[in-house]
């Protein structure tokens, strides 16, 4: 697994460099997670043809993966910093159960899956410090999450491979949208 942000050799070799600002740290954290997702997607796509055939193979997707919408205020038109930040944090909290599901779904990238999960937890903490309106952030219900996890794991092998692909694709899209929005803040 890659070294987490702030622990690479360049940081060690340059002790006099200015410390990262909060925004820079968040930006770097998201890019680090995106790198991890790319590695996981590579394994998933190499293992099966899910990545090419997912559109034709599915008629309905009831996974309810978090997705950015116009009303969330994260897009350039109708941008709203506070609404958007709440959406990003809420979305990441909702993704956590899916990231938990991804653990044990990878053979050669097991550490990478764990790194993505742990780095997302850190990212949530960074963002919570930045948010003024923490009351607006709804935390997913643990009982509902446990039930969802059981259902995800009860699927057959093919559906689990498809689920893995869909989670990684959605998480990547969500983080990319978040990154663009956070750079406007």
């Amino acid at each position: 697994a890659p070294v987490p942000p702030g622990e690479d050799s360049k940081d060690v070799a340059a002790p006099h460099r200015q410390p990262l600002t909060s925004s820079e740290r968040i930006d770097k954290q998201i890019r680090y997670i995106l790198d991890g997702i790319s590695a996981l997607r590579k394994e998933t796509c190499n293992k099966s043809n899910m990545c090419e055939s997912s559109k034709e193979a599915l008629a309905e997707n009831n996974l309810n993966l978090p997705k950015m919408a116009e009303k969330d205020g994260c897009f350039q038109s109708g941008f709203n910093e506070e609404t958007c930040l709440v959406k990003i944090i809420t979305g990441l909290l909702e993704f956590e159960v899916y990231l938990e599901y991804l653990q044990n779904r990878f053979e050669s990238s097991e550490e990478q899956a764990r790194a993505v999960q742990m780095s997302t937890k850190v990212l949530i903490q960074f963002l919570q410090k930045k948010a003024k309106n923490l009351d607006a952030i709804t935390t997913p219900d643990p009982t509902t999450n446990a039930s969802l996890l059981t259902k995800l794991q009860a699927q057959n092998q093919w559906l689990q491979d498809m689920t893995t692909h869909l989670i990684l694709r959605s998480f990547k899209e969500f983080l990319q949208s978040s990154l663009r929005a956070l750079r406007q803040m």
Epitope: E56, A59, E60, N62, N156, W158, L159
Partner: nanobody, 125 residues
Framework: QVQLVESGGGLVQAGGSLRLSCAAS????????MAWFRQAPGKEREFVSA????????YYADSVKGRFTISRDNAKNTVYLQMNSLKPEDTAVYYC??????????????????WGQGTQVTVSS
Amino acid sequence: QVQLVESGGGLVQAGGSLRLSCAASGRTFSNGPMAWFRQAPGKEREFVSAISWRTGTTYYADSVKGRFTISRDNAKNTVYLQMNSLKPEDTAVYYCAAERVGLLLAVVAEGYDYWGQGTQVTVSS
């Protein structure tokens, strides 16, 4: 254990109709989708139609759209396939399939856990 039993197949003339039934036992129909697939001699098993038990939404292969109708009867734990305007190319063994969870609805055979033994449909010209 889930058991799926199809019935209603037979020999019919082109332009005729048939109604297939798929009765499920050992299953509560609250989650996963049910589907019909077919396999003609020397060909791969192909998707025909599916119904989401959760939403009631129906899906059809382009080749049967407008001619076939899938429906369900929750009380009887049964799924039906009404086939109208049958063509010789509809000749195949028709299989009923079920999936137990229902988070995803697939239109490929790999997305289903349980299968019936099949019922033969022959359409003569």
